[in-house]
């Protein structure tokens, strides 16, 4: 276990517009040393968002997840403490982190910048991989259910925190709650690789869960209130398209934002699946200024790969 | 286009189960959370829960839990709900719906499928 | 759970009228709110999502509005192929629950 000084593992510079609870399944506090405080929210699709802990909507949906934790326990669920270096989940899930999340490296003087190009919502979904939330970040203690990412969460745009392939040295984020669907909050954060000591006050807990039968894609957002964007068919929706560009307001203008997705699973920023209006309620994707994760992609031995966010343009075809 | 089709009318006993299919086209299937919302007769819409097709993770209302089994088959892009014990208060029409990513409102419905459950 | 409840349950007007129905969550549901139509031996169609965003190909007659736990969808002039029954669902948190419905019938 690390005793080491507690650094500022995720800073956010942008702060999530609203995104329903139930697609949320666990949320963190930042750490002290990061100044700006801040609650760090992972979606169903294992996205990670910033968001304002002094509105009102992040107190409610932290009182959600609190009181599904606490049934969870009581209906038998295990919380496992977690102090210092949390071991990744062993399965990928598709993740991708806002334009306000930037991961920092752990202890190494270098580290790349992803700009990431707007990605489809579908295609990070079919990223493949899920954001672990670094060591060191406190978080509301539950149980967490297996980390299968399920369709494509939703979220302001500009506040979701890039997803980040497990890697040996990145905390699990804990589960408040159990899996549920949420919209991706867009939210910039900073994650640095590096566990830093967590204190036991501060730590969450995590329930191991089994795997998903297989890497889901990351959660999708429509555009709000800009009508259903077309699904896209081919290869690269849900399961391997990633998160849209979003907006920063609430909810409705969830809109994806850029983010740059850590991927285990290169893809392509090509052959974004168009998909064909839908009836109505999908985000149009908006390029926001892209998220810069920082990480030393050797530390983490995966392939960053920044991917369009398409999927709010093109929700089903 | 989006379109879900559901399989045809079911009559049932009293503690039989039944299995409602929902076959989907139009988008990649795995991508959308697909839900299954049920009508009584007369009455308003009651969610039953969801099975995200891209795992097969599914989430159920604590109403329905125990005897709802939510499943899809990707081959076929189809979902499926069965429901056992069946009592006649489960008499409604089942439907399957999907929605965005983003929140779980319902933008595509399949047509029903009418579940009577009589002795 | 949070309950919907819509009101009235059922309302009659005629063509051309403006119609209101309301429909109040038993929590703050922050906007998470759906409206959709029904009409008899046919699934429910999406009108409206959060609170206030129309659906595509939804007239622009058709209007949300509201906050917190209070929201309302409104027809500013009623058409004939609008009398249905009308229902608002919650989706901010799980389970998802809707409102009774609203009958909206010919005067």
């Known amino acids: 276990q690390h005793h080491g000084v507690t650094k500022c593992n995720i800073t956010c510079s942008k702060m999530t517009s609203k995104i329903p609870v139930a697609l949320l399944i666990h949320y963190q506090q930042n750490q002290a040393s990061c100044g700006k405080r801040a609650i760090i929210l992972e979606t169903r699709q294992h996205r990670l968002f910033c968001a304002d802990p002094k509105e009102q909507w992040v107190k409610d949906a932290m009182q959600h997840l609190d009181r599904q934790a606490a049934a969870l326990t009581r209906n038998g669920g295990t919380f496992e403490k977690q102090i210092g270096e949390v071991k990744p989940r062993t399965t990928p899930a598709a993740g991708g982190m806002d334009e306000s999340v930037v991961l920092e490296p752990e202890a190494t003087g270098e580290s790349s910048s992803l700009e990431p190009t707007p990605s489809s919502q579908e295609a990070q979904r079919a990223l493949g991989t899920s954001p672990e939330l670094p060591t060191g970040v406190t978080g509301s203690s539950g149980t967490r259910l297996p980390p299968t990412p399920k369709a494509q969460d939703g979220g302001p745009v500009g506040t979701e925190l890039f997803r980040v392939p497990p890697v040996s040295t990145a905390a699990t984020w804990q589960s408040s709650a159990p899996h549920q669907p949420g919209p991706s909050l867009w939210a910039e954060a900073k994650t640095s690789e590096a566990p830093s000591t967590q204190d036991p006050s501060t730590q969450a807990s995590t329930a191991s869960s089994p795997a998903p039968e297989e890497n889901a894609p990351s959660e999708g957002q429509r555009v709000w209130g800009q009508g259903q964007s077309p699904r896209p068919e081919n290869s690269l929706e849900r399961e391997e398209m990633g998160p849209v560009p979003a907006h920063t307001d609430a909810f409705q203008d969830w809109g994806p934002g850029s983010m740059a997705h850590v991927s285990v699973v290169p893809v392509s920023s090509e052959g974004t699946p168009s998909r064909e209006p839908v009836a109505s309620g999908s985000w149009t994707p908006k390029a926001e200024e892209p998220i810069h994760a920082t990480m030393d992609p050797q530390r983490l031995g995966v392939l960053i790969t920044p991917v369009p966010d398409a999927q709010a343009a093109t929700r089903r075809q | 286009q989006v379109q879900l089709v559901q399989s045809g009318a079911e009559v049932k006993k009293p503690g039989a189960s039944v299995k409602v299919s929902c076959k989907a086209s139009g988008y990649t299937f795995t991508n959308y959370y697909i839900h299954w919302v049920r009508q009584a007769p007369g009455q308003g819409l009651e969610w039953i829960g969801w099975?995200?097709?891209?795992?097969?993770?599914?989430k159920f209302n604590e109403r329905f839990k125990g005897r709802t089994t939510l499943t899809r088959d990707k081959s076929t892009n189809t979902a499926y709900m069965e429901l056992s014990s069946l009592r006649s208060d489960d008499t409604a029409v089942y439907f399957c719906?999907?929605?965005?990513?983003?929140?779980?409102?319902?933008?595509?419905w399949g047509q029903g499928t009418t579940v009577t459950v009589s002795s | 759970d949070i309950q919907m409840t819509q009101s009235p349950s059922s309302l009659s007007a005629s063509v051309g009228d403006r119609v209101t129905i309301t429909c109040r969550a038993s929590?703050?549901?922050?906007?998470?709110l759906a409206w959709y139509q029904q009409k008899p031996g046919k699934a429910p169609k999406f009108l409206v999502y959060n609170e206030k965003t129309l659906a595509d190909g939804v007239p622009s007659r058709f209007s949300g509005s509201g906050s917190g736990t209070q929201y309302t969808l409104t027809i500013s002039s009623l058409q004939p192929e609008d009398f249905a029954t009308y229902f608002c669902q919650q989706f901010w948190s799980t389970p998802y629950t809707f409102g009774g419905g609203t009958k909206v019938e010919i005067k």
């Open positions: 099975i995200y097709p891209g795992d097969g993770s599914p």
């Open positions: 929590g703050n549901i922050h906007n998470f």
């Open positions: 719906a999907t929605g965005p990513t983003d929140g779980d409102y319902f933008d595509y």
